[in-house]
Every structure is written in structure tokens, then in C-alpha cells.
């Protein structure tokens, strides 16, 4: 029957023996033998390995491509990848922020419910009755119609989701 060998969490089974994994920030250059320990080497500049590993190559640091609207949020190290984010006025289109899209403005008749962030687009909602938005905007919410009554005026033109009420002097005709 085959022997069952269990290695620790920072080791790997290789040809019947437990070899040490290479620590984050390094890569494998030689497997261990009965006489020698695992040989590891630091990742070169521009590379990283984030976990205990037995990989022959470190991973290349990500490049935040300016032509895709990306910029560096956090520089990579020997143990971590570069983190990209989007330029002002744009947001990431995926969890890994591989590309950016312009924030979407809320069109007239819609107000901003949630402003865009670096990872999410603007959330718009239709202006309910009694509220309006008359411009495309990344931050304006729906505003309430003017109360003509409060100003001792009368409604000359009803408001819509895109326009405010127009008030005027009360007619003297009885």
C-alpha cells in the first residue's frame, strides 16, 4: 500500500517528500531533495507573488493603462499587485477594474439617488409627482416644485418631472 504523506500548510509534496514552499515575494528556483532544502529567489522589480508558492515565475505587476482611463491607486510590491482605479469622472466596469467608463449623468426628469464612486455608476431615479429636474447632472437631485400658495401666488403653468411650476399673481377677476 502507498504511504500517505501529509505536509504542513507551508510545504508541498514533491516526489514523496515535503518541500518548503517559497514565501510571498519569492519564487521557486529548485525543488528540495533529501540533501537540500527548497531554493527560492526574490521576485524581480515589477513582479510579485502574493502567496506561499512553488511557482517558477513571479507574476508581472499590473499596468494601469492611461488610455483606458486607469491610474495607479496603490503601487505594487514584491508581495502584492498594483491596484488600479479610474481617473476623475469615471468608474471601474468590473471588480478587478480592468476598464473605466464615464459616469452617467441623470437626464432631465431624473434625479441622482446615489452619486457615482470609483467603483459604481450614478444611480438615477424618476422624479416623483411634485418634484422636477431640468438638467443632465452627476449630482443634482430632484427638486420640489415651487409652492405658489406659500408665496401667495397662483399656478400659471403646472409643473412636470422636467419643469418647475410657473407661478403668477392671483387674478383679480371674481
Amino acid at each position: 500500500l502507498g504511504q500517505c504523506v501529509t505536509c504542513s500548510d507551508k510545504q508541498y509534496l514533491h516526489d514523496g517528500q515535503c518541500c518548503d514552499l517559497c514565501q510571498p515575494g519569492s519564487r521557486l528556483t529548485s525543488h528540495c531533495t533529501a540533501l537540500e532544502k527548497t531554493q527560492c529567489h526574490p521576485c524581480d522589480s515589477g513582479e510579485f507573488s502574493a502567496q506561499w508558492n512553488r511557482e517558477i515565475r513571479c507574476h508581472q505587476h499590473r499596468h494601469c493603462e492611461p488610455n483606458q482611463g486607469l491610474r495607479v491607486k496603490k503601487e505594487g510590491t514584491a508581495e502584492s499587485d498594483t491596484v488600479c482605479t479610474c481617473k476623475e469622472g469615471q468608474h471601474c466596469t468590473s471588480k478587478d477594474c480592468e476598464a473605466c467608463a464615464q459616469h452617467t449623468p441623470c437626464i432631465p426628469g431624473f434625479g441622482v439617488m446615489e452619486m457615482a464612486t470609483e467603483t459604481t455608476d450614478t444611480v438615477c431615479h424618476p422624479c416623483p409627482v411634485g418634484f422636477f429636474s431640468n438638467q443632465s447632472s452627476l449630482f443634482e437631485k430632484c427638486y420640489p416644485w415651487t409652492s405658489c400658495e406659500d408665496k401667495n401666488l397662483e399656478v400659471l403653468q403646472k409643473g412636470t418631472s422636467q419643469t418647475n411650476v410657473i407661478c403668477g399673481l392671483k387674478s383679480r377677476m371674481r
Epitope: 529548485s30 524581480d44 511557482e55 517558477i56
Partner: antibody
Framework: EVQLVESGGGLVQPGRSLKLSCAAS????????MAWVRQAPTKGLEWVAS????????YYRDSVKGRFTVSRDNAKSTLYLQMDSLRSEDTATYYC??????????WGQGVMVTVSS | DTVLTQSPALAVSPGERVTISCRAS??????MHWYQQKPGQQPKLLIY???HLESGVPARFSGSGSGTDFTLTIDPVEADDTATYYC?????????FGGGTKLELK
């Protein structure tokens, strides 16, 4: 005894495809990174591609990226090199080699690939 | 790419000591390896990580160096050592081989 035996070479026209195989025996194939290294006639050695033990990571030299695909079948202990859009400069003896970390501790006898019209 | 420069050929007499050099265009730390290739055969690993002797390789072979300058020494040379010797680095991407040094016996 470690053995690596390549097959699938031959004469092929530019632009055509060829698939090389390497049958491995005498060691636990799924434990090792594997590679293809080539040698043009009367020339030196040139690393072509490597693949991780699980097949999850692959590495290529720039001149073959997008044209060559390295793969493996651990159940069959076989390494493959799919070569598409072949060029005359791909003419060489192709060796299958076993990685021990970052060097090559065992090599096959090699298989000749000639790209010519 | 890292360029590895080797002298193309050497001729020595059996019993002598020979040193084969390999110079890298940039530092490769100790990630340098040496192979022997006899005519019509596949390469064979001799030395790995600059100075480690591969199992089964005679102790006549030794390696030294770090950074950019590396040496393979054969002492004493035997008739069977007629071959081309290649250095290989695994520090930079892509891994590269030297052009080879052809060793001939007088």
C-alpha cells in the same frame, strides 16, 4: 528512469499547423513544470514555452505568443505544443524538457520541425 | 532580453584544466546553469544555481560566479568531454541561453 519521448515533427508549409507531443515516464509528471526548448540547425538553444504542474499557468517567448499553445494531460503524462501560423524561422529541433525549478534537469531526444514551401 | 556571451571555441589537451566563461549583459544573481551537449544528442544538465553539481555528474565539473560573470571548470579534462557547453539564466524573462562554447581536445 526518467524518459521524455517527443513525436509529431515533420515538414510543414509556412502558415500551416503542427502539434508536437511528449510522452513522459519514470517520474510523477503532475509534480513538475514542463517546457519546450528549440535548437535551430547548427545554432544554440532557445526556450520556447513552459507550463505549470496543473496547467493553470503558461509562459511563452514573445516570438511565439499567440501562435503556439503549450498544454498537458496529467492523466496521460503527456505534454503538447500546438504550433499555428508556422514561419520558416520556427525550423528547429524541438526538445521537451522537465523543469526542476528554473532549470531543465531532463531532456527528450528532440523532434525535427521543418517549415518550408 | 539578457544576452549571455560565451567564447565560441576552446582546444585543450586531456588532463589539463579548462575554464569556460559566460558573461551576462545584466545581473542574474546566482540563477545561472550549465549544460553539456554532445553531437547528435540532447543537452544534459551539469551545474545548477551557479555552483551546485547535478546528481550523477562527475566532480571534475564545477561552477562558480554570481551577478554577471560565471565560470564552468573541468579539471582534469577527459577525451569524453568533447562537446558544446551552454550557460542558461533564469533571472529575466525570457530565460536565455548563451551561444555555446565548443570544447575540442588536442
Amino acid at each position: 528512469e526518467v524518459q521524455l519521448v517527443e513525436s509529431g515533427g515533420g515538414l510543414v508549409q509556412p502558415g500551416r499547423s503542427l502539434k508536437l507531443s511528449c510522452a513522459a515516464s519514470g517520474f510523477t509528471f503532475s509534480n513538475y513544470d514542463m517546457a519546450w526548448v528549440r535548437q535551430a540547425p547548427t545554432k544554440g538553444l532557445e526556450w520556447v514555452a513552459s507550463i505549470s504542474p496543473s496547467g493553470g499557468r503558461t509562459y511563452y517567448r514573445d516570438s511565439v505568443k499567440g501562435r503556439f499553445t503549450v498544454s498537458r494531460d496529467n492523466a496521460k503524462s503527456t505534454l503538447y505544443l500546438q504550433m499555428d501560423s508556422l514561419r520558416s524561422e520556427d525550423t528547429a529541433t524541438y526538445y521537451c524538457a522537465r523543469h526542476d525549478g528554473s532549470y531543465f534537469d531532463y531532456w527528450g531526444q528532440g523532434v525535427m520541425v521543418t517549415v518550408s514551401s | 532580453d539578457t544576452v549571455l556571451t560565451q567564447s565560441p571555441a576552446l582546444a585543450v589537451s586531456p588532463g589539463e584544466r579548462v575554464t569556460i566563461s559566460c558573461r551576462a549583459s545584466e545581473s542574474v544573481s546566482t540563477l545561472m546553469h550549465w549544460y553539456q551537449q554532445k553531437p547528435g544528442q540532447q543537452p544534459k544538465l551539469l551545474i545548477y544555481l551557479a555552483s551546485h553539481l547535478e546528481s550523477g555528474v562527475p566532480a571534475r565539473f564545477s561552477g562558480s560566479g554570481s551577478g554577471t560573470d560565471f565560470t564552468l571548470t573541468i579539471d582534469p579534462v577527459e577525451a569524453d568531454d568533447t562537446a558544446t557547453y551552454y550557460c542558461q539564466e533564469s533571472w529575466n524573462d525570457p530565460w536565455t541561453f548563451g551561444g555555446g562554447t565548443k570544447l575540442e581536445l588536442k
